[in-house]
């Protein structure tokens, strides 16, 4: 019906306005409404002006899109000609009464379909339904994926590309780890991935100055070390070094009036020469204090070495050996005086005897046929040696003695000459001063070691060798090597060390084979004024341990392998060190600091006497230990 109406209108328009000329009223009759008429008539007049006879010119024709009046007029009512819609965005154009309707393709909007719809911003379909990237395009959109992702067949979802599965050799010898959108070539800790060689290469952490003092790099890691011998230990961060701190302060007060007899491990502490009138006789008076049971207090001889007198201690008692042209004698007597108390000792040459008194009470009287030392040229010349004797004397002694004596003397009076001159010499030399108070035991000051040669082989036992150690310790610092067995090749097949525990104010005891800790006894309160008792037994098959808290046989997967390392070393030759380590590499043991404190050691049933050591640092006190420092009210 609608198209029929359109055809009628078209016929009327032909008849009224093209074949004839029409005015506006006649045009109103054709369209039967004002809007269309008002739209049509001005345009009709333009057509007339263009094509009416006599008005036509070539120039005008060239500006007109229509070849004749009919075409020009017929086109006026069609709102869709020329096309008002956006050609890209429209689907169809519908002519209306002086208007048009553009129907848009999907993805376009607007009266003329001139505006692209941004599907990516559609709130009802977030991101256009794309899982990653939404790309808006004129009239449409498409989804895309980020690098390392691939589009699924629905063209919306992006899936991670598993590069590790896609190219199994992508990381070479490293481990490939897939991560969203990418992959990583992973190396074990301490290794770095090399893109060129597609392999994991060891990081030389030492070249990156990771450690404060010494650094040892190894495949996959590194270890920092601190110079324990200079009093440093590794801090908790395992990189920096900190001073090994005192956990039990000791009373290290000394007095120059007290002469320390064990200043030298080997050698005389003091040498005096007397030139007195010939009527003089030998005499020595002094107060003496020691816990040592054997050693030389003083040795006196004539200027020509023909006569000598030795005042010593053996089994804790005074011993006198003498030799001159008339006689050769040895006498031991009196009470035991190695009790740590001050004992007044006097040795006096009388006309026919030598009198030895302790606390002014005679304990020995040694007969002598003549003067001890023969005067020459009207003078009695005598040499006196404290805490030792010249080396050649050793072979002349009536009974051999270990000369080393850890003790002190005070208030001495030699040859009735008082102490004048001697005190001045001692005053200047700090290491000749004796501690004011001492206790029984051996003291390791944290600056040196003692070496012993001990044969651990036990022929009667099936194990072949065994190490049974008892330690009585009272440490002063919480870190240090107490005992170490050292091989000829500078390795440490066994060590017992102390380290400050991670828990405050306590210590751990480490048992180590070479640089591996085979057992750690944790959190013991060892820094106290009470001694702690530790025992351990080790042979090629077992390791047993006894501490104040428990007794146990240690066994773990790695222990047998470590004991095999120890076994191999024990079959060769090992040296035993107390109080620290000799010059071995820092990396040879987990701890390398010297032990500081008191310690008594018994190995395989024998109490070790530091006076019997092959070598001993001078500062180690074999038979005396400083008392614990007591805080006084005004200090």
């Amino acid at each position: 019906a609608n198209s029929l109406l359109e055809e009628t209108k078209q016929g009327n328009l032909e008849r009224e306005c093209i074949e004839e000329l029409c005015n506006k009223e006649e045009a109103r009759e054709v369209f039967e409404n004002d809007p269309e008429t008002d739209y049509f008539y001005p345009k009709y007049l333009v057509c007339l002006r263009s094509f009416q006879t006599g008005l036509f010119t070539a120039a005008r024709q060239s500006t007109n899109a229509y070849p004749d009046l009919r075409s020009c007029v017929n086109a006026i009512p069609d709102q869709c000609s020329p096309l008002p819609c956006n050609e890209d965005g429209y689907m169809s154009c519908k002519d209306g009464k002086a208007s048009f309707t553009c129907t848009c393709k999907p993805g376009w909007q607007g009266e003329k379909c001139e505006f692209d719809i941004n599907e990516c911003k559609d709130p009802s379909n977030i991101n256009g339904g794309c899982s990653q990237i939404c790309d808006n395009t004129p009239g449409s959109y498409h989804c895309s994926c980020k690098n390392g992702f691939v589009m699924l067949s629905n063209k919306k979802d992006c899936k991670d590309v598993d590069e590790c599965s896609l190219k199994p050799s992508i990381c070479g010898t490293a481990v490939c780890k897939n991560i969203p959108g990418d992959f990583e070539c992973e190396c074990p800790e301490g290794y770095r991935y090399n893109l060129k060689s597609k392999s994991c290469e060891d990081i030389d952490e030492c070249s990156e100055n990771m450690c404060a003092q010494l650094c040892v790099n190894y495949p996959g890691g590194y270890t920092c070390y601190c110079d324990g011998k200079k009093g440093f230990k590794l801090a908790q961060d395992q990189k920096s070094c900190e001073v090994v701190s005192v956990c039990l302060p000791l009373n290290l007060d000394t007095k120059y009036e007290l002469l320390y007899l064990a200043e030298q491990f080997a050698g005389v502490v003091l040498y005096l020469k007397f030139r007195l009138p010939e009527i003089s006789r030998f005499s020595a008076e002094f107060d003496f204090r020691t816990y040592d049971s054997e050693g030389v207090i003083l040795y006196a001889e004539s200027i020509d070495h023909s006569a000598w007198l030795l005042i010593a201690l053996r089994g804790g008692k005074i011993e006198v050996q003498l030799k001159n042209e008339h006689t050769s004698k040895i006498t031991t007597g009196g009470d035991v005086i190695n009790n740590g108390l001050w004992n007044m000792v006097s040795v006096e040459e009388l006309e026919h005897s030598i009198s030895i008194k302790i606390a002014k009470e005679a304990v020995m009287d040694i007969n002598k046929p003549g003067p001890l030392f023969k005067p020459e040229n009207g003078l009695l010349e005598t040499k006196v040696y404290f805490a030792g004797f010249p080396r050649k004397v050793e072979s002349e002694l009536i009974k051999p003695i270990n000369p080393r004596l850890d003790g002190c003397i005070r208030s001495w009076n030699l040859m009735k000459q008082g102490a004048s001159g001697i005190k001045e010499i001692i005053q200047e030399k700090q290491n000749k001063h004796c501690l004011v108070t001492v206790e029984k035991g051996s003291y390791y000051p944290g600056s040196g070691i003692a070496q012993f040669h001990i044969d651990y082989n036990n022929v009667s036992s099936a194990e072949g060798w065994h190490v049974n150690v008892t330690l009585n310790i009272r440490p002063s610092t919480g870190t240090g090597v107490m005992l170490a067995l050292v091989s000829g090749n500078n390795t440490v097949p066994f060590a017992v060390s102390l380290v400050d525990s991670t828990s405050e104010k306590s210590q751990d005891i480490l048992l180590s084979v070479e640089n591996t800790v085979i057992y750690r006894i944790q959190a013991l309160s060892l820094c106290s004024d009470q001694q702690s008792h530790l025992e351990f037994r080790v042979n090629r098959n077992n390791l047993e341990l006894s501490t104040p808290l428990k007794i146990e046989t240690i066994s773990h997967e790695d222990l047998q392998r470590q004991l095999a390392v120890l076994d191999k070393a024990m079959k060769a030759k090992v040296a035993t060190y107390l109080g620290g380590l000799p010059d071995v590499p820092f990396s040879a043991t987990p701890v390398n600091a010297f032990y500081n404190g008191c310690m008594e050691v018994n190995i395989n049933g024998v109490q070790l006497d530091l006076d019997e050591a092959i070598s001993k640092h001078n500062d180690i006190r074999a038979h005396s230990c400083p008392s614990v420092w007591k805080k006084t009210k005004n200090s």
Epitope: V150, M151, L152, S153, D162, P180
Partner: antibody, heavy 119, light 106 residues
Framework: EVKLEESGGGLVQPGGSMKLSCAAS????????MDWVRQSPEKGLEWVAE??????????YYAESVKGRFTISRDDSKSGVYLQMNSLRPEDTGIYYC??????????WGQGTTLTVSS | QIALTQSPAIMSASPGEKVTMTCSVS?????MHWYQQKPGSSPRLWIY???NLVSGVPGRFSGSGSGTSYSLTLSSMEAEDAATYYC?????????FGGGTKLEIK
Amino acid sequence: EVKLEESGGGLVQPGGSMKLSCAASGFTFSDAWMDWVRQSPEKGLEWVAEIRSKANNHATYYAESVKGRFTISRDDSKSGVYLQMNSLRPEDTGIYYCTLTTAFLFDYWGQGTTLTVSS
Amino acid sequence: QIALTQSPAIMSASPGEKVTMTCSVSSSVSYMHWYQQKPGSSPRLWIYDTSNLVSGVPGRFSGSGSGTSYSLTLSSMEAEDAATYYCQQYSGYLYTFGGGTKLEIK
């Protein structure tokens, strides 16, 4: 729109042979990895074979149970993937699906074709 | 070969009920994919890379897990969710599927 259409299924005797075809459309076939997955009530879903794209040298992979008996092939010019099955066994019975595989998952599945191996 | 074990094999749930099904792996894998299959139809990719829902999959579905344990969870069961769900992984040039969990509506 992605379309996968399997054909070639049917009844075959044990020891016999059969060739399955899969016609693909709606995606760039030459870039795609194509797989065959089968389903049976006894074994459930079971991956059979995979053929990768030209970029991956048309590499082929097979399930242990079909190795040496089945051959997967493709014709990129025809957008087709094929499964030649020899020495068939009763346990090969099931619905065979052709799949478009994207990054190690079965992104799109055809409707399937049924293979029955029975005497 | 890595084996996938789905549990339970069959389960039923009332509308609105929360549902969880699991997929245990014999050795650790990086990703798990899930498929939905309704009777008479081909399986459809449902969840990929452990937790990503395929476009058009209702938000009441979710996936999670890592290493050797993965799960698919449905926060509120609806009738249209009744189907069999399969888990799948790829490792060492082999694809493996779980035995499936059949989810029925009560």
